[in-house]
């Protein structure tokens, strides 16, 4: 049984204010069962960026169909980028549990930074 790896291929993503940023995350295994969430930052103060199951995230859309049985692509797009969006983004796999899901593995993170404005 293959060990789950969380792949975030870009260490650094340069973005432009007002544009849409795509943050990539793929997994190498469908197991264990449980959701993948996106956070900015680490530790207790990290900010939830996207949770498919609950919450309202009007600027975030998924690249792939997260409800599909065999989906292994958890990449997201964030629209209308502002300077407040800079930071390091992590996709995090949770193992399904009761009563709460348990964090299982995190991707290495992608730092989002502002690039030069287009001339």
């Amino acid at each position: 049984e293959e060990e789950l790896q969380m792949i975030q291929p870009e260490k650094l993503l340069l973005v432009t204010v007002g544009k849409t940023a795509t943050l990539h995350c793929t997994v190498t295994s469908l197991l264990p069962v449980g959701p993948v969430l996106w956070f900015r930052g680490v530790g207790p103060g990290r900010e939830l960026i996207y949770n498919q199951k609950e919450g309202h995230f009007p600027r975030v859309t998924t690249v792939s169909d997260l409800t599909k049985r065999n989906n292994m692509d958890f990449s997201i797009r964030i629209s209308s980028i502002t300077p407040a969006d800079v930071g390091t983004y992590y996709c995090v796999k949770f193992r399904k549990g009761s009563p709460e899901n348990v964090e299982f593995k995190s991707g290495p993170g992608t730092e989002m930074a502002l690039g030069a404005k287009p001339s």
Epitope: L30, T61, D65, T67, K68, R69
Partner: antibody, heavy 124, light 106 residues
């Protein structure tokens, strides 16, 4: 109670197009993926097409790929299947199905409800 | 297509199992009962082992390794039907088995 009512079947001409509509009630339509399944006379079940709960993602069986379009209107609680360039092999009873809170289009293990079906006959 | 036996038979009151294999790597199975050709199928099990509220508890489903199993305990004459399994393949396409005809003897 959950109901799925299909309409739009009937006698169709080869090379023509058909549009089937399924109206769902008794459940939160926008929360469930939907699929179309057909059964030719004397044959088994065949998956035709599916669509995610929000309508962003669509899936098609090999027999209709390139000829079919599935879409949904969550406000009206309807899902539509359009099938072009009809062939005799498209003759079948077409069933609308609902996924039971898991999976998406094509994930047939998640089907928990079926419509009564609408019969389509493709003949000249 | 998924692989399931063409036919099974049982006496009333017996237990019968129908197997299904060939789903994708994240395979789960659903089971659909069709009592006569042209009549609408009925879901008896979905998502491996979930049972719709109107289905008797005599119907149960399970999955071991890559094989799904529909179990009907205390088989009754009214259970005579064709049972189809359904899943998705590794490409995500929907796929059914060819159907298993259950004959209730006696």
């Amino acid at each position: 109670a959950v109901t799925l009512d299909e309409s739009g079947g009937g006698l169709q001409t080869p090379g023509g197009a058909l549009s089937l509509v399924c109206k769902g009630s008794g459940f939160t339509f926008s929360s469930h993926a939907m699929n179309w399944v057909r059964q030719a006379p004397g044959k088994g079940l065949e998956w035709v097409a599916g669509i995610s709960s929000d309508g962003r993602f669509t899936y098609y069986g090999a027999a209709v790929q390139g000829r079919a379009t599935i879409s949904r209107d969550n406000g009206q609680s309807t899902v539509r299947l359009q099938l072009n360039n009809l062939r005799a092999e498209d003759t079948a009873t077409y069933y609308c199905t609902k996924n039971g809170g898991c999976g998406s289009g094509g994930d047939l293990d998640c089907i928990d409800a079926w419509g009564h079906g609408t019969e389509v006959i493709v003949s000249s | 297509a998924l692989t399931q036996p063409a036919s099974v038979s049982a006496n009333p009151g017996e237990t019968v199992e129908i197997t299904c294999s060939g789903g994708g790597s994240n395979n789960a199975y659903g089971w659909f009962q069709q009592k006569s050709p042209g009549s609408a199928p009925l879901t008896v099990i979905y998502d491996n082992g979930k049972r719709p509220s109107d289905i008797p508890s005599r119907f149960s489903g399970s999955k071991s390794d890559s094989t799904g199993t529909l179990t009907i305990t205390r088989v009754q004459a009214e259970d005579e039907a064709v049972y189809y399994c359904g899943s998705a393949d590794n490409s995500g396409a929907g796929v059914f088995g060819a159907g298993t005809t259950l004959t209730v003897l006696g």
